[in-house]
């Protein structure tokens, strides 16, 4: 804001002069600028207890420029408005008010919510998530071998985070139990403890291909359990498929 304060040089008639400094078109000793040169805005500037006229190239915060033929001035925005385009269109509200369509409101209208960061009334945004990604491989303790039952996981992304009043996001992670075809761990696939452990020789009646039940890997000590015969294993496989459960974790 460029301010110009007038100083009288040539007496036109009582208290008015046209030989002013800066942006003043007419001025007086007592009042400063009375009117401004074209395109400048008249404003009152408080100096101590006194207000004097100044001419500005743009209006200060809380004011907007009004232009009439050959007479422009800075006009106050409404009481609840900090910056405005004109009397009826606010662009930033004072503290405690929310901006909506150029107006400052105590509360936002139905269907809108207050954004306390921008101090605006905004549309309520509901959560949006992507389609599920494919299920991960069936694993147990990070391994895909050496067990029969494990868990598999799938995830989806949050495309749109919800606003304060929006619907919460559904779970983005889903875990379920799974079964795998018996598969011996190749050399180097088993965990350190598994490699260090001296395996017992199979008892009579046990299948050499049989792998430990999932429970046998759940214990960190990996205590071997009794092996199942082939008939029992088939029976268990059917039961496991029926029992397959989905566990969700909310993010």
């Amino acid at each position: 804001q460029n301010a110009s304060r007038g100083r009288r040089q040539r007496r036109m008639h009582p208290n008015v002069s046209q030989g002013c400094q800066g942006g003043c078109a007419t001025c007086s000793d007592y009042n400063g600028c009375l009117s401004c040169k074209p395109r400048l805005f008249f404003a009152l500037e408080r100096i101590g207890m006194k207000q004097i006229g100044v001419c500005l190239s743009s209006c200060p915060s809380g004011y907007y420029g009004t232009r009439y033929p050959d007479i422009n001035k800075c006009t106050k925005c409404k009481a609840d408005c900090d910056t405005c385009f004109n009397k009826n269109f606010c662009t930033k509200c004072k503290s405690g008010f929310y901006l909506h369509l150029g107006k400052c409101l105590d509360n936002c209208p139905e269907g809108l919510e207050a954004n306390n960061h921008t101090m605006e009334c905004v549309s309520i945004v509901h959560c949006e998530v992507s389609e599920w990604n494919p299920w991960s491989p069936c694993t147990k303790k990070g391994k895909t071998c050496g067990f029969k039952r494990g868990t598999e996981t799938r995830v989806r992304e949050i495309i749109q985070h919800p606003s304060a009043k929006g619907n919460l996001c559904p779970p983005t992670n889903e875990t379920r139990k799974c079964t795998v075809q018996r598969k011996k761990c190749q050399k180097g696939e088993r965990g350190k403890k598994g490699r260090e452990r001296k395996r017992k020789k199979p008892n009579k009646g046990e299948s050499k291909e049989a792998i430990p039940d999932s429970k046998s890997l759940e214990s960190s000590k990996e205590i071997p359990e009794q092996r199942e015969n082939k008939q029992q294993q088939k029976k268990r496989k059917v039961q496991d498929k029926q029992k397959s459960v989905s566990v969700s974790t909310v993010h």
Epitope: M12, H13, N15, V16, Q18, A25, T26, C27, S28, N31, G32, C33, L34, S35, C36, F42, L44, Q51, I52, G53, T66, Y68, P69, D70, I71, K73, T75, K76, K78, A79, K87
Partner: antibody, heavy 119, light 107 residues
């Protein structure tokens, strides 16, 4: 001292055009803002419009379609024309001036002229 | 347009009385307010501008105050020559509008 004097017919017929002139002395109409104001008998004041130092005009929107303000700088005069008058336009018409927002608004007035609209 | 509501519309007072006239604007007029005195058959005379600035030659018993939407003209000690009609005028924006007037009569 700035002086303003209104002149024009005191009687105008309905539907005709009221024409008044304000002659200024003590200052040039090429500085300041030159206004017309009226006052119906026994009532309050109503601002009609102004002509600026450069000859630009602004009228009260309530009268705009009927008002024309013009000037003659060679005679240091400005004029008011109000068309399609009715009895409601009967009033004392004043010319007055101001020099900007920072000084007295309407520091100088003419003595006023009564215009009666009647057939 | 900004409306100016002046009160009272008339009042009766005696010489020496303190008289207060108020003007209420329909919106904040940011101190752009003048007061005029008008006597019968005469043109109005400007007393005060920018809310509280006295025009040269106007007696100091006249004073103005106010801000926002509410403004007051005070005559501290009414004199015989003060019996007249008083008008407020806002000039915060165009069109300019006057109050309806307050007639100060002798009691």
């Amino acid at each position: 001292e700035v002086q303003l004097v209104e002149s024009g017919p005191g009687l105008v017929k309905p539907s005709e055009t009221l024409s008044l002139t304000c002659t200024v002395s003590g200052d040039s109409i090429t500085s300041g803002y030159w206004n017309w104001i009226r006052q119906p008998p026994g009532k309050g004041l109503e601002w009609i419009g102004y002509i600026s130092y450069s000859g630009k005009t602004y009228q009260n929107p309530s009268l705009k379609s009927r008002v024309t303000i013009s000037r003659d700088t060679s005679k240091n005069q400005f004029s008011l024309k109000l068309s399609s008058v009715t009895a409601a336009d009967t009033a004392v018409y004043y010319c007055a001036t101001y020099y900007g927002y920072g000084g007295p608004f309407f520091a100088y007035w003419g003595q006023g002229t009564l215009v009666t609209v009647s057939s | 347009d900004i409306q100016m509501t002046q009160s009272p519309s008339s009042l009766s007072a005696s010489v020496g009385d303190r008289v207060t006239i108020t003007c209420k604007a329909s919106q904040d007029i940011d101190s752009y307010l003048s007061w005029f005195q008008q006597k019968p058959g005469k043109a109005p005379k400007t007393l005060i501008y920018l809310t509280n600035r006295l025009v040269d030659g106007v007696p100091s018993r006249f004073s103005g105050s106010g801000s926002g939407t509410d403004y007051t003209l005070t005559i501290s000690s009414l004199q015989p020559e003060d019996f007249a009609t008083y008008y407020c005028l806002h000039y915060d924006e165009f069109p300019l509008t006057f109050g309806q007037g307050t007639k100060v009569e002798i009691k």
